[in-house]
């Protein structure tokens, strides 16, 4: 678990096809916000907006193992 928040700025402008994997970190003792961190296919990590409807949809599909999320 992270010992502090990792994300301050977030984006929702990401295409699901560019996402290799997703990590969803719930609120905890050390960070009072949900953080969604995507690892892109080029290896970079990026913070996604957990409240954006399209990100919620991507998260649901990715965690369900549906790689065709668009």
């Amino acid at each position: 678990a992270e010992l502090r928040c990792m994300c301050i700025k977030t984006t929702s402008g990401i295409h699901p096809k560019n996402i290799q994997s997703l990590e969803v970190i719930g609120k905890g003792t050390h960070c009072n916000q949900v953080e969604v961190i995507a690892t892109l296919k080029d290896g970079r990590k990026i913070c996604l907006d957990p409240d954006a409807p399209r990100i919620k949809k991507i998260v649901q599909k990715k965690l369900a193992g549906d790689e065709s999320a668009d």
Epitope: R4, C5, M6, I8, T10, H30, N32, K45, I46, C47
Partner: antibody
Amino acid sequence: QVQLVQSGAEVKKPGASVKVSCKASGYEFTSYWIHWVRQAPGQGLEWMGNISPNSGSANYNEKFKSRVTMTRDTSTSTVYMELSSLRSEDTAVYYCAREGPYSYYPSRQYYGSDLWGQGTLVTVSS
Amino acid sequence: EIVLTQSPATLSLSPGERATLSCRASQSISNNLHWYQQKPGQAPRLLIYYTSRSVSGIPARFSGSGSGTDFTLTISSLEPEDFAVYYCGQNNEWPEVFGGGTKVEIK
């Protein structure tokens, strides 16, 4: 110019609350955490917590969790720290400070607080 | 919660001398250790961040080193304006913690 400007000194009675403001200008408000740090007379620095100007989510030092509330107003780039149930030991200078800048890319390499407000003296006395 | 221990508490030196300040963490904080200078009646000022990275506008005589749990701030040649209190601070994890400070005074 780039600055954090805090509200003026306050004198409060024990049991009361105080709300200190910190207005940011000259930089991208949403790229920096805003921290609150206090310093009792002749003592060291004590971290109270911080707030994300983006989400408004605040993280508090366990010591103050039941008494402190941090909020922000993005329209005026102002952050507020309210401390309730004041006691004499809360007499201190309260500073806001920024940490950043950060982008959309998470990192485990963190910046120090490179910009501080001028401080607000809060005196708690009956 | 991490504890940062600074030593010595007071350092008595003359202008032109070299100052070496120590900060020890109770557990590893990677390199997320920063150094601040504070003068009476003023807010702290960031000198060094992420152990050894320089801050714009800070004289080159200030340098930092270390990693993990042991860190050092070095002032290569003390100037009259360098006599102040120095704090280390970590933000590898929250709560952020500061050391108790080292006062550098004129001998």
